[in-house]
């Protein structure tokens, strides 16, 4: 009669995470008499995947049924695969012996390889805020995937970016990848509702990249421009001039008029006009009476933008030009400001 | 529901030999092997020996070997662990388990005593 | 025969801290094959850990089991006052199978 052989028909068999994987085996006789057990990997150190007999695998189950007399079918189904599961598969025969069985004969191994999708994208921005002109740095970052190959591509609205490095790891063999790209992109005055998109496509996907995305708006600071002009006069004495705040991002701004280098009044602001492009405009004013000044009053707009060192614009009010009226002490009506919007 | 159930406590006279019986039910008795295992009071552990009910095969630890004899009656999906020359050194519980290691008879109290 | 030697023999911890229990083995044993169990009075072992580090059904993540070779480990992070067991180690990579001499984790 021939010796028993051990048959694995399928030298490698592909399984998408979270299904469950068929490892087929048979053996050609009955004798010698002794257990069926599969093994992960080769050598001393190989993992016990299933003991017909003894020990717990949970998730594995037998095709046919083990016990029946004449079985000669030894095939195991595992379930719930992930890429950890990746490896050599052994159907390895024991004859009986004491105290331990001994290995009688090996199958020829089946490769078991999992496909695993990437978790998505995870895009981050720089920790501080860049103004226009300026060229930042996005991270987008993937991971658990297997098969190695893998595509990444970054978009600026929609427009490719070229200006990237990326990279796959580990470099050598093993269960799973992650891939870490960075891309730089340079900021414009009109980035406020831009996006930046990482795209990842591999296998698992069918052809529906991943993406991951994060806005222009989280990283970009617009300062503002400054115009100070003199209105029309609202009342005998009285000046009326305003600060126009224009094309400002985000809307974090506090005001400051000086008279003279003193501080007459400081607000933050609040009813902002949104612009097309996402920037804010802004605009405050203060009544001036010329008639408790003899010189003439330098004023200035300061403003603060977003925590950064102040900005400022002055304007000089011409004093001789207006009468005065004596015995007034006033040098400004802080009525508070209207908060109009000025395009 | 996998269920290993023992039978009663006994008390034996030393010199005397035991029977503890262990009926499965909930999975198919021939599938994998039922362990025995011996504990005396306030100790640990002990493996005694195994069988497999397929064909009857077993394995035994030197420490009891001359005196366990350990059978299975597949037709009553019962295995049975028998220990004879019985010593005060033998009062302890006995479980039978699953070959799996997670089903647990409740457990069999012999008591040696003269 | 592989003898599995546990330390400590009694730990005596309060409820919220963190159990480690050792388990070293007199010759190397394949990780597939070292299991850990819980014991309570009066009752018959429950299976916890199983090929050194595998949760088993119904135990909760508290429970975890490391090493490899000659040397395991079962640690609990935060022990709940229902852990307070004996804990054995199992070896069945040989025979004769053994267990450790058990650890007792007491209440302080």
């Known amino acids: 009669e021939e010796e028993l052989q051990v048959i694995q028909p399928d030298k490698s068999v592909l399984v998408a995470a979270g299904e469950t994987a068929t490892l087929r085996c048979t053996a050609t006789s009955l004798i010698p008499v002794g257990p069926i057990q599969w093994f992960r990997g080769a050598g001393p150190g190989r993992e016990l995947i299933y003991n017909q007999k003894e020990g717990h695998f949970p998730r594995v189950t037998t095709v046919s049924d083990l016990t029946k007399r004449n079985n000669m079918d030894f095939s195991i189904r595992i379930g719930n695969i992930t890429p950890a599961d990746a490896g050599t598969y052994y159907c390895v025969k024991f004859r009986k012996g004491s105290p331990d069985d001994v290995e009688f004969k090996s199958g020829a191994g089946t490769e078991l390889s999992v496909r695993a999708k990437p978790s998505a994208p995870v895009v981050s921005g720089p920790a501080a805020r860049a103004t226009p002109q300026h060229t930042v740095s996005f991270t987008c970052e993937s991971h658990g995937f297997s098969p190695r190959d893998i595509t990444l591509k970054w978009f600026k609205n929609g427009n490719e970016l070229s200006d990237f490095q990326t990279n796959v790891d580990p470099v050598g063999e093993s269960v799973s990848y992650s891939i870490h790209s960075t891309a730089k992109v340079v900021l414009t005055r009109e980035d406020v509702h831009s996006q930046v998109i990482c795209e990842v496509a591999h296998v698992t996907l069918q052809g529906d990249p991943l993406r991951g995305t994060a806005n222009l708006s989280e990283t970009i600071r617009v300062p503002p421009t400054l115009e100070v002009t003199q209105q029309p006069v609202r009342a005998e004495n009285q000046v009326n001039v305003t600060c126009q705040v224009r094309k400002f991002y985000p809307q974090r701004l506090q005001l400051t008029w000086l008279e003279n280098g003193n501080v007459s009044r400081t607000e933050t602001a609040s009813t902002v006009t949104e612009n097309k492009d996402g920037t804010y405009n802004w605009m405050s004013w203060l009544l001036v009476n010329v008639s408790a000044h003899r010189d003439d009053v330098k004023l200035t707009c300061q403003v603060e933008h977003d925590g950064q060192p102040a900005v400022s614009k002055s304007h000089d009010l011409k004093v001789s030009a207006h009468p005065k009226e004596q015995g007034s002490n006033t040098a400004a009506e802080n009525t508070g400001s209207n908060e109009r919007n000025i395009y | 529901e996998v269920q290993l159930v023992q039978s009663g406590a006994e008390v034996k006279k030393p010199g005397a030999t035991v029977k503890i019986s262990c009926k499965v039910s909930g999975f198919n008795f021939e599938d994998t092997y039922i362990h025995w295992v011996q504990q005396a009071p306030g100790k640990g552990l002990e493996w005694m020996g195994r069988i497999d009910p397929a064909d009857g095969d077993t394995k035994h630890n030197p420490k009891f070997h001359d005196r366990v004899t350990i059978t299975a009656d597949t037709s009553t999906d019962t295995a049975y662990m028998e220990l004879s020359s019985l010593r005060s050194e033998d009062t302890a519980v006995y479980y039978c388990?699953?070959?799996?290691?997670?089903?647990w008879g409740q457990g069999t109290t012999v008591t040696v005593s003269s | 025969e592989i003898v599995l030697t546990q330390s400590p023999a009694t730990l005596s911890l309060s409820p919220g801290e963190r159990a480690t229990l050792s388990c070293r083995a007199s010759?190397?044993?394949?990780?597939?094959?070292l299991y850990w169990y819980q014991q309570k009075p009066g009752q018959a072992p429950r299976l916890l850990i199983y090929?050194?580090?595998n949760l088993a059904s119904g135990i909760p993540a508290r429970f975890s089991g490391s090493g490899s070779g000659t040397d395991f480990t079962l640690t609990i992070s935060s022990l709940e006052p229902e852990d307070f067991a004996v804990y054995y180690c199992h070896q069945w990579y040989s025979y004769p199978r053994t267990f450790g001499g058990g650890t007792k984790v007491e209440i302080k």
């Open positions: 010759s190397s044993v394949t990780s597939s094959y």
């Open positions: 090929s050194a580090s």
């Open positions: 388990a699953t070959g799996n290691y997670v089903n």
